[in-house]
Interface confidence: low
Amino acid sequence: QSGPLPKPSLQALPSSLVPLEKPVTLRCQGPPGVDLYRLEKLSSSRYQDQAVLFIPAMKRSLAGRYRCSYQNGSLWSLPSDQLELVATGVFAKPSLSAQPGPAVSSGGDVTLQCQTRYGFDQFALYKEGDPAPYKNPERWYRASFPIITVTAAHSGTYRCYSFSSRDPYLWSAPSDPLELVVTGT
């Protein structure tokens, strides 16, 4: 085969958001018959020549960016997309509230606000059942998450996290859940 081998996939199970002391498995998946896998933590000298890394108890310094690649014969694959492994529960949980309130009419507006006693400059909002954080353009790193023109799809349970741009993979514990109810749908 000419050119680099196609990149493998790298995933964290059950999630890339891992509470301190909880287990997580990083799994690198390439095509069948791979000779060698290499899983590495970026910006460090750490790597292992195995496809699976089981972390029995998440720690602060295991948080960070990971990637993997594989070798067949003398050829190395392209690296996987980076996986951002986040340690949660490093800091006390923020509080999450809805303005003007957690019950909102369909078509109305609501703002979810994440607040903390600490001087964090970054916030992430997650909706239960969605693997990716809720992102509103240019408001990902703000304490306020406006939801304009609410629909039934916005109903659900939300949690937020706070963290610092200086240590972007060390997050607070999740806020208590906030149930957003959309009425009149």
Partner: antibody, heavy 121, light 107 residues
């Protein structure tokens, strides 16, 4: 309370053997890598050995390789250091300390320490 | 092996002084560096991990900085309890290595 309680130190003749123990409590011992660090009288700290949480990886300082063996019994929450062919330069206070969960190499700084046990050769 | 060179080996200072201890690695260790405080007859106590993160229970007057090969431990205002020996340690690669120590004495 998180603690590491050490035992097994003493006086031994050159060429002799000794086994140090470190009993852990207050945390999930079986999830943590563990280390031994030593300090000769009036000297600085020297890392001695490491064992992975499940015992599958072990690393040693060159100065003790082939003479010392680190092991653990997770059912007893206990870490061991078997020291054979002891030399005068092995005289030191030996500390056990946690190494967190990790990959093929080390992961975090040591923040739980035993009180140390003196070995005199 | 990665050599850790600490300076000075002895430092005399007074209560209230701002004190700086430096540590140099023989090769880049990113930020995998810790600082410990040790008092005579006692086990070391973790002050700083990951070069600049304050360990749980460590007073806020201690701070760490640096990345790569050059690192610094700073005590913003020296207190009576701070007179001790300080060690840096790299945990980037095995064998793990410590600096030679800095003994902080009362002037």
């Amino acid at each position: 309370e998180v603690q590491l309680v050490q035992s097994g130190g003493g006086v031994v003749q050159p060429g002799g053997s000794l086994r140090l123990s470190c009993a852990a409590s207050g945390f999930t011992f079986s999830s943590y890598g563990m280390h031994w660090v030593r300090q000769a009288p009036g000297k600085g700290l020297e890392w001695v050995a490491f064992i992975r949480y499940d015992g599958s990886n072990k690393y040693y300082a060159d100065s003790v390789k082939g003479r010392f063996t680190i092991s653990r019994d997770n059912s007893k929450n206990t870490l061991y250091l078997q020291m054979n062919s002891l030399r005068a330069e092995d005289t030191a206070v030996y500390y056990c300390t946690d190494g967190w969960a990790e990959m093929a190499t080390t992961d975090d700084a040591f923040d739980i320490w035993g009180r140390g046990t003196m070995v005199t050769v | 092996d990665i050599q850790m060179t600490q300076s000075p080996s002895t430092l005399s200072a007074s209560i209230g002084d701002r004190v700086t201890i430096t540590c140099r690695a023989s090769e880049g260790i990113y930020h995998w560096l810790a600082w410990y405080q040790q008092k005579p007859g006692k086990a070391p106590k973790l002050l700083i991990y990951k070069a600049s993160s304050l360990a749980s229970g460590a007073p806020s007057r201690f701070s760490g900085s640096g990345s790569g090969t050059d690192f610094t431990l700073t005590i913003s205002s020296l207190q009576p309890d701070d007179f001790a020996t300080y060690y840096c340690q790299q945990y980037s690669n095995y064998p793990l290595t410590f600096g030679g120590g800095t003994k902080l004495e009362i002037k």
